[in-house]
């Protein structure tokens, strides 16, 4: 059965700046990746980025840079300033759509040991 992994990291150089990395462990070819925060995309989450292997990348603030790392993994950097910036307990979710298998998703947040006060 395919699986999705999610890693969330706070950047040491920039307070409240996050890097989200997601990957798909499965045999199918990826058709679309959707990254959201505040919960899964279909359950009240807000879309941050949509990545398509052929048709490009769409992203919305506070997403700063979304990119493919490999054919089956992506990364997303979030801006750290502004009213819409994430906080330490924000949940980030990644949904990978693979044809014809379907979609798999997983969510993650900053590990408890990551203290925003130490990130500067």
């Amino acid at each position: 059965t395919p699986e999705v992994w999610v890693q969330v990291r706070m950047e040491a150089t920039e307070l409240s700046s996050f890097t989200i990395r997601c990957g798909f462990l499965g045999s199918g070819s990826i058709s679309l990746v959707t990254v959201s925060w505040g919960g899964p995309n279909g359950a009240g989450g807000t879309t941050l980025a949509v990545l398509h292997p052929e048709r490009g990348i769409r992203q919305w603030a506070p997403a700063r840079q979304a990119r493919w790392e490999t054919q089956s993994s992506i990364s997303l950097i979030l801006e750290g300033s502004g009213a819409s910036s994430p906080c330490a307990n924000t949940t980030f979710c990644c949904k990978f759509a693979s044809f014809p298998e379907g979609s798999w998703e997983a969510c993650g947040s900053l590990p408890p040991s990551s203290d925003p006060g130490l990130s500067a």
Epitope: G28, S29, S31, L32, P40, N41, G42, A43, V50, H52, E54, R55, K95, A97, F99, P100, E101, G102, S103, E105
Partner: antibody
Framework: EVQLVESGGGLVQPGGSLRLSCAAS????????MSWVRQAPGKGLELVAA????????YYPDTVKGRFTISRDDAENSLYLQMNSLRAEDTAVYYC?????????????WGQGTLVTVSS | DIQMTQSPSSLSASVGDRVTITCKAS??????VAWYQQKPGKAPKLLIY???NRFTGVPSRFSGSGSGTDFTLTISSLQPEDFATYFC?????????FGQGTKLEIK
């Protein structure tokens, strides 16, 4: 304008074979996943075959597995369904459909359908 | 396979009525739900994708809602051209499966 036009349907005896074709136009055929969906008289819709845009991945339900083969020819902008060992229960209108990645694999374009009748 | 149970199977209504069709999935299908309209002798047409997004050219009287396992298609004010059969579909896990259909008839 997106167009899908099926052909190849007709009357065939049980145990016989048919090859359905779907001619696509108005879009970049090679960029889309495609499917065949059938509808028995007065009944609902059933996916019978799907193929990924690169042609590497296919799907068949148990009802047709081993008897039906989906294929595509991107140079000819065509989708095919080879149907062997046909049974009375395969009698249906067969539709060719296009999946849109950005719509969660919803089928955003359909052909007009071609009727396959399996009867002695 | 994920089962999509649609209700009612048939429905009589009048022009101007508000109509609701429901679809229940046998397990969570995230937001990967679409709705189609089919008229006799014609191919299905996509109405709604991702639960609540209207496809190009679909009138605003059609709306979709729901999450997880329970989904709804609502027609706010029935027009004569809306009398047809409606199908829900999940595209979350293969095989994509459809509801059995709801036939909307004139009262």
């Amino acid at each position: 304008e997106v167009q899908l036009v099926e052909s190849g349907g007709g009357l065939v005896q049980p145990g016989g074979s048919l090859r359905l074709s779907c001619a696509a136009s108005g879009f970049t055929f090679s960029s889309y996943h495609m499917s065949w969906v059938r509808q028995a008289p007065g009944k609902g819709l059933e996916l019978v075959a799907a193929i990924s845009r690169d042609g590497d991945s296919t799907y068949y339900p148990d009802t047709v597995k081993g008897r039906f083969t989906i294929s595509r020819d991107d140079a000819e902008n065509s989708l095919y369904l080879q149907m062997n060992s046909l049974r009375a229960e395969d009698t249906a209108v067969y539709y060719c459909s296009r999946h849109e990645d950005y719509f969660g694999f919803a089928m955003d374009s359909w052909g007009q359908g071609t009727l396959v009748t399996v009867s002695s | 396979d994920i089962q999509m149970t649609q209700s009612p199977s048939s429905l009589s209504a009048s022009v101007g009525d508000r109509v609701t069709i429901t679809c229940k999935a046998s397990q969570s299908v995230s937001n990967d739900v679409a709705w189609y309209q089919q008229k006799p002798g014609k191919a299905p047409k996509l109405l709604i994708y991702y639960v609540s997004n209207r496809f190009t050219g679909v009138p605003s009287r059609f709306s979709g809602s729901g999450s997880g396992t329970d989904f709804t298609l609502t027609i706010s004010s029935l027009q004569p051209e809306d009398f047809a059969t409606y199908f829900c579909q999940q595209a979350y896990r293969s095989p994509w499966t459809f509801g059995q259909g709801t036939k909307l008839e004139i009262k």
